[in-house]
Interface confidence: low
């Protein structure tokens, strides 16, 4: 038919930081590239319809759908979706083609479904369908990356089977203990699966896709190393690949490494062997012990020996289940208002955990860090001296685990007070819990020394508001007392405060706060 | 257990060659590197050549362009050639996988 226009149908995903999407969807916005999604007419369909290629998007993510019609002279047009009309603005761009945009922000289920565009033209009406759902994230797997040995080479392949199929990225790094970490000089990062280079000091391989990243260490055991005071450990599950790698250096090549397990020499094809000159001369030789599938008797004592240094044990223990294990009993603790304190969890996890800290319903970021006896610890400093609940959550595939904190902080209580016509009440959050007292202000007593002890109701911890408990104190009002001024005043180890309360017939009660 | 057992050696005439071979058990073999060594008299085992599991070879610097080395991972077998050979030669030839060294075999050269 010549009478139809040429039609382009694009998806422009945006980036999450994106400013410039929420604004009238007539903006042009900057964005990715956008995508084409090749509007095709529909056959046997009524009336002229076009069916762009079905959207996925991610849950959160921000797309537009455009139109771009190459047809002469104006054009309106009205979006349809789930049977409500959407407000259409089209505009032209610098070659003269009607754009027609829809912004979806912050995709969720709600916003998946059928958008029915309907355009009319001077010419000809015609309809655009665009299908758009929500990525099945479901589907998406990150597993920790494992290694394999390359045939035929001197090389190691990391894999890592998670879907969307994940970057694979080595992280190598040939000095000693903190300045390994990710942000270091030190530490030199190679995008690809197969590693030549097998001799440095620390040698992790990292997969990453939608999901995050996980990496793999390659377990070492370096006989050049004072060992440490306990026996490394490394778990494994059952069916999962063992990789341990024994290095040595030497002044020349008059060594060989080999491998026991429990006193017996590793069975033939579970070994190989690397070498190399170092730059002052040296040899270095790294023997590699390996398991594609262990099974519970691969449990045991690994030892790496050398003709020329002092061997050095792994203890390799193989599980059925992962675990998180760690003492879950809830810790409180009570520190002044400006000491320096952290909480820390202290724990022993295989597979490696996922972790956060939680206060007052934010989440934090949660850095776990190895220590030399095969635990973990994850700390937490951020608290900025808020008392309360603080609960540390972690998990692996096959466990979780939670650890719940108090923190109290130790300060001179401060004092609100409210009134109605029956009665007025004090409430305080210091720490420790304070102590009440009621004073009648009267011509007998001008500096309120005149203690009320008749209807006074003292409820401590009454309200626990992030875990921090405030304490009240209620004066139900009597003849005696109504139209005299009184003070309540709650006090700790730490000093007393105090607030004065008119008790008046009904009305606005005026407070004076008396330090 | 990894067995080697090295032979070709005997007595040559200076400037004449040798093939040494080694033959070894197990079936670690294609998998690892294989080093040749030899021990003169009275001095201390001195490492002569390596070829890794991929076939790359390494050779002691003053030896290079004498001697080559290399493997026959079907016949379980590393060789080692000895070209041009010198009086200063004269050793027992060992060959070692791992921490397991052969028998050794002796290389005499005279002038």
């Known amino acids: 038919n010549q009478d139809l226009p040429v039609i382009k149908c694009v998806l422009i995903n945006h980036k999450n930081n994106d400013s410039s999407v929420g604004k009238s969807s007539s903006y042009p916005m900057v964005s990715e590239s956008p995508e084409d999604l090749g509007c095709a007419l529909r056959p046997q369909s009524s009336g002229t319809v076009y069916e762009a290629a079905a959207v996925e998007v991610d849950v959160s993510a921000s797309i537009t759908l455009q139109v771009l019609v190459d047809a002469p002279g104006n054009i309106s047009c009205l979006w349809v979706f789930k049977h409500s009309s959407l407000n259409c603005q089209p505009h032209f761009d610098l070659q003269n083609r009607g754009v027609v945009s829809m912004v979806i922000l912050k995709m969720t289920e709600t916003q998946a479904g059928e958008y029915l565009l309907f355009i009319q033209s001077e010419a000809t009406n015609y309809t655009i369908l665009f299908t758009v759902s929500i990525r099945n994230t479901l589907l998406y797997t990150l597993r920790r990356p494992y290694f394999r040995k390359m045939e035929n080479q001197d090389a190691l392949v990391c894999i890592s089977e998670s879907v969307p199929e994940p970057i694979v990225e080595w992280v190598l790094c040939d000095s000693q203990g903190e300045s390994c970490k990710e942000e270091s000089p030190a530490v030199v990062k190679k995008e690809e699966k197969v590693l030549h280079e097998l001799f440095g000091t620390d040698i992790r391989c990292c997969a990453r896709n939608e999901l995050g990243r996980e990496c793999t260490r390659l377990f070492t055991i370096d006989l050049n190393q004072t060992p440490q005071t306990t026996l490394p450990q490394l778990f494994l599950k059952v069916g999962e690949p063992l990789w341990i790698r024994c290095k040595a250096v030497h002044v020349n090549h008059g060594f060989g490494l080999t491998w026991e397990l429990e006193n017996k020499a590793l069975e033939e094809g579970n070994y190989f062997e690397m070498s190399t000159y170092s730059t002052n001369r040296t040899m270095i030789r790294i023997l590699f012990a390996f398991v594609s599938s262990v099974a519970r008797n691969d449990t045991g004592y690994y030892t790496c020996s050398s003709s020329k240094h002092p061997s050095q044990s792994a203890l390799v223990t193989i599980v059925e289940k992962g675990f998180i294990n760690a003492t879950n009993s809830s810790e409180d603790y009570e520190i002044d208002q400006y000491e320096e304190f952290c909480f820390s969890v202290r724990f022993k996890a295989y597979p490696q955990i996922r972790c956060t800290w939680t206060f007052s319903r934010k989440s934090f970021p949660c850095e776990q860090k190895g220590l030399d006896n095969g635990y973990s610890i994850s700390k937490f400093c951020n608290h900025k001296h808020q008392p309360g609940e603080y609960i540390f959550h972690a998990e692996n595939d096959d466990a979780q685990f939670t650890k719940m904190f108090t923190l109290n902080i130790r300060r001179k209580p401060q004092v609100l007070a409210e009134a109605s016509a029956s009665q007025a009440s004090c409430f305080s959050d210091g720490y420790p819990l304070p102590s009440w007292t009621w004073k009648k202000c009267s011509d007998k007593s001008p500096n309120c020394t005149e203690e009320i002890t008749e209807g006074v109701w003292n409820r401590k911890a009454n309200r626990k508001v992030f875990g921090q408990w405030v304490s009240s104190s209620t004066l139900n009002m009597s003849e005696a007392i109504k139209g005299f001024l009184v003070k309540c005043c709650a006090y700790n180890s730490l000093g007393t405060s105090c607030e004065t309360i008119l008790l008046n017939s009904p009305g606005p009660f005026p407070f004076i706060q008396d330090n | 257990q990894v067995q080697l057992q090295e032979s070709g050696g005997g007595l040559v005439q200076a400037g004449g060659s040798l093939r040494l071979s080694c033959a070894a058990s197990?079936?670690?073999?294609?998998?690892?590197?294989i080093d040749w060594y030899r021990q003169a008299p009275g001095k201390q085992r001195e490492w002569v050549a390596q070829?890794?599991?991929?076939?790359?070879?390494h050779y002691e610097p003053s030896l290079k362009g004498r001697f080559t080395i290399s493997r026959d991972n079907a016949k379980n077998t590393a060789y080692l050639q000895m070209n041009s050979l010198k009086p200063e030669d004269t050793a027992v030839y060992y060959c070692?996988?791992?921490?397991?060294w052969g028998q050794g075999t002796q290389v005499t050269v005279s002038s």
């Open positions: 070692r996988i791992l921490d397991y």
């Open positions: 197990g079936s670690t073999f294609s998998r690892n590197y």
């Open positions: 070829i890794t599991s991929a076939g790359n070879t």
